[in-house]
Amino acid sequence: ALDAAYCFRNVQDNCCLRPLYIDFKRDLGWKWIHEPKGYNANFCAGACPYLWSSDTQHSRVLSLYNTINPEASASPCCVSQDLEPLTILYYIGKTPKIEQLSNMIVKSCKCS
Amino acid sequence: ALDAAYCFRNVQDNCCLRPLYIDFKRDLGWKWIHEPKGYNANFCAGACPYLWSSDTQHSRVLSLYNTINPEASASPCCVSQDLEPLTILYYIGKTPKIEQLSNMIVKSCKCS
């Protein structure tokens, strides 16, 4: 799996999980989140050569097409596969509220 | 939806469905498929600015992050959303076989 266990341990130009820390206020303009101040969102990036973690038959076809037609702009792309929620704390007045924001953290990637 | 009805009628730099015809023999080196000789596979390409057909909260976060950090390589990517199968005819010896290859045709796209 193209997850932290594999990607953060190996130097990999191909599609893999990359670390990315996001500060809510500075990077997103989200002012209301009290805790955490930011989080490890991660992202997916890298080349998608033939058979590198292809998601579907179409992405396999596209990467094969791309090897024969490298000048074409048609090629698979490295995107998120497994995502996890993030629990946040914010306040309404003096009342603390806990909320779970879905699909906030990327755990693994694929070529799609 | 970023499908043929919308994308093939509009000139769109952002993420959209693009036409792509694939010739099995020439483009993939697949000599075993008798019919069809090729098919309209299509592909997804284009920019993913903030809120342009974002697939998940993470892709929204990433495109928003990208507006204030445009030099960062972290940005969502335009990939296939809905896929359809393709029916093919091939021969085993002189015996014709009909098979459905799943996820061969892209019908719409998303930013992921």
């Epitope: 206020k25 500075r26 002012k31 209301w32 309404i92 007045g93 | 928003l64 507006t67």
Partner: antibody, heavy 121, light 110 residues
Amino acid sequence: QSLEESGGRLVTPGTPLTLTCTASGFSLSSYDMSWVRQAPGKGLEWIGIIYGGSGSTWYASWAKGRFTMSKTSTTVDLKITSPTTEDMATYFCARGRDGGAGGSRNGYSLWGQGTLVTVSS
Amino acid sequence: AYDMTQTPASVEVAVGGTVTIKCQASESIYSGLAWYQQTPGQRPKLLIYAASDLASGVPSRFKGSGSGTEYTLTISGVECADAATYYCQQTWTDGGIDNPFGGGTEVVVK
């Protein structure tokens, strides 16, 4: 504690104009500062914000490239890069209700009196 | 994103009556909402923040409520001094927005 805008005047289209908001009685380094404009007879239109601590800026999607915000220890500037007749309005600067991390999450409690910008050839 | 729709655009109310102004966000703003009052030729004045907290010096006849995407400002026992335009503002985010303010509601006191 007060805010005072200055620099509003009659300009010809395309002539850059800088508006200044001068703060008294508090430190700009602790507060989020915004610019909001109001065309005659129209509603409030947010232009952007400059954060107290980091100094990072956010602009309304329509305002990107048309306006630039910057600050010193006592002033916040708004540069209208190439004014058009659509930019004719009273320009207000506003301060976030809370200092520090709270910033402007609870709205703007302190406003200047506004400065009028007229664009005409 | 986070577009604010305010209704009605204008409302007439008798002295002593009650007026209700609604504000709808295009997505959840987690109670990050402020209300302002503006009289002609004057700067806006903060009335309510965090959807329901009264700003200092604001009379208790002003009441804010709501959560998620739906918010309400209620003015009860309306006085002549309440004739003004009222604006809501989402304060959840500054990122990727067009305008955090609603279009405004003019309150005419008879």
